[in-house]
C-alpha cells in the first residue's frame, strides 16, 4: 500500500496586500480517516489558520467543496492579504481519534506579502 | 490496464480547427484530472492544458490561452481539446495524460497523435 | 525553470544519477521517452512514487530544490530522454530533457 502524501506543490507564494492568496495542498489517500488542517509556522507555537471540519475562520475559505465525495484537495483561500500573514504555512494530516493523532505534514509553503502597488 | 488513446490529428491549414479526443479505461475517469502535452519536432515537452475531474476547472499555457478549449465527458470517460486559429508552431505530437493527486504530476500517458498546421 | 543536465553517460551495470534543480517546487517527477515521438512513460511521481510497472532500478529522491533520478544497474534499454517535471506551475513544468547514452 502506498504511503500516505501530503502534497503542498508550491515553496512559496507572493501576493500584495489587499490581494487574496491561495495555498494548494492535496492528499494521495483517504485513508486513514481524519481531517487536514492548516497552520503557520511549525513546533509547538505554531497557529492554527484552518479547520476544514469545524471553527470559524472569516477570511479563510476551502477551494475545493470539503464535502464533495473522494475530495483530496485540501487548499484554502486567505483573502485581504496583510504584511502579517506573511509565514510558512503547513497543510497537516491528523488520524481520527480522541484526541486527533498528527499523522503528516506538507513541505510547506512560504507566503511573502508585497506592497499594494500605488 | 489504463488506457489512453487519442484520436486521429492531421494535416491543417494556418488558421484552421482541428479538435483531438482521447477516450480513457482502466481508472475511474470521473475522479481524475486530466492533462494536454504535445512535442514539437525535436523539442522537448510542453504542458498544453489541464482539466479538474468535475470539469468545472480549466488550466492553460499562455502559448494556446483564448484558442484551445479543454473538456471532458465523463459519461463516455473522454477527454477533448478544441484547437481553433492553428499556428504553424502548434504542428506537435499531442499526448493525453492523466494526472496523479496533482495536476502537474502525470502517472500515465497516451501514444499521442500528431497534428501538422501547414499551408 | 527547471534545470537539468543536456545529457549524460553511463556504463553497462553502472550507476548514473541526473539532477533536476530550480524553480519553486517542493516536489519532483521523472518521465522517460525512448526515441522523439514515441510515448512518455512515468518513472517516478511525486519525488519517490513508482508505477508498479517500472522496474526497481529506477528510484527518486528530492532534498532541497534538487531532484535526483537514479537508475541502478544501467541496461542498454535505458538509453532515453528523461524529463523532470515539478509541482510548481510557475516552473513550466518539464525541464529541457536529458539523453543518457549508455556505453
Known amino acids: 500500500e502506498e504511503e500516505l502524501q501530503v502534497i503542498q506543490p508550491e515553496k512559496s507564494v507572493s501576493v500584495a496586500a489587499g490581494d487574496s492568496a491561495t495555498l494548494n495542498c492535496t492528499v494521495s489517500s483517504l485513508i486513514p480517516v481524519g481531517p487536514i488542517q492548516w497552520f503557520r509556522g511549525a513546533g509547538p507555537g505554531r497557529e492554527l489558520i484552518y479547520n476544514l471540519k469545524e471553527g470559524h475562520f472569516p477570511r479563510v475559505t476551502a477551494v475545493s467543496d470539503p464535502t464533495k465525495r473522494n475530495n483530496m484537495d485540501f487548499s484554502i483561500r486567505i483573502s485581504n492579504i496583510t504584511p502579517a500573514d506573511a509565514g510558512t504555512y503547513y497543510c497537516v494530516k491528523f488520524r481520527k481519534g480522541s484526541p486527533d493523532v498528527e499523522l503528516k505534514s506538507g513541505a510547506g509553503t512560504e507566503l511573502s506579502v508585497r506592497a499594494k502597488p500605488s | 490496464d489504463v488506457q489512453l488513446v487519442e484520436s486521429e490529428g492531421g494535416v491543417v491549414r494556418p488558421g484552421e480547427s482541428l479538435r483531438l479526443s482521447c477516450e480513457a479505461s482502466?481508472?475511474?475517469?470521473?475522479?481524475?484530472?486530466m492533462t494536454w502535452v504535445r512535442q514539437a519536432p525535436g523539442e522537448g515537452l510542453e504542458w498544453v492544458s489541464t482539466i479538474s475531474d468535475t470539469g468545472d476547472t480549466a488550466y492553460y499555457a499562455d502559448s494556446v490561452k483564448g484558442r484551445f478549449t479543454i473538456s471532458r465527458d465523463n459519461s463516455k470517460n473522454s477527454l477533448y481539446l478544441q484547437m481553433n486559429s492553428l499556428r504553424a508552431e502548434d504542428t506537435a505530437i499531442y499526448y493525453c495524460a492523466k494526472s496523479w493527486i496533482w495536476w502537474t504530476f502525470f502517472d500515465y500517458w497516451g501514444l499521442g497523435t500528431l497534428v501538422t498546421v501547414s499551408s | 525553470a527547471l534545470t537539468q543536465p543536456a545529457s549524460v553517460s553511463a556504463n553497462l551495470g553502472g550507476t548514473v544519477e541526473i539532477t533536476c534543480s530550480g524553480g519553486n517546487s517542493n516536489h519532483y517527477g521523472w518521465y522517460q521517452q525512448k526515441s522523439p515521438g514515441s510515448a512518455p512513460v512515468t518513472l517516478i511521481?511525486?519525488?519517490?512514487n513508482r508505477p508498479s510497472n517500472i522496474p526497481s532500478r529506477f528510484s527518486g529522491s528530492t532534498s532541497g530544490s534538487t531532484s535526483t533520478l537514479t537508475i541502478t544497474g544501467v541496461q542498454a534499454e535505458d538509453e532515453a530522454v528523461y524529463y523532470c517535471g515539478g509541482s510548481s506551475t510557475g516552473d513550466g513544468i518539464f525541464g529541457a530533457g536529458t539523453t543518457l547514452t549508455v556505453l
Open positions: 482502466g481508472f475511474t475517469f470521473r475522479n481524475s484530472y
Open positions: 511521481y511525486a519525488d519517490t
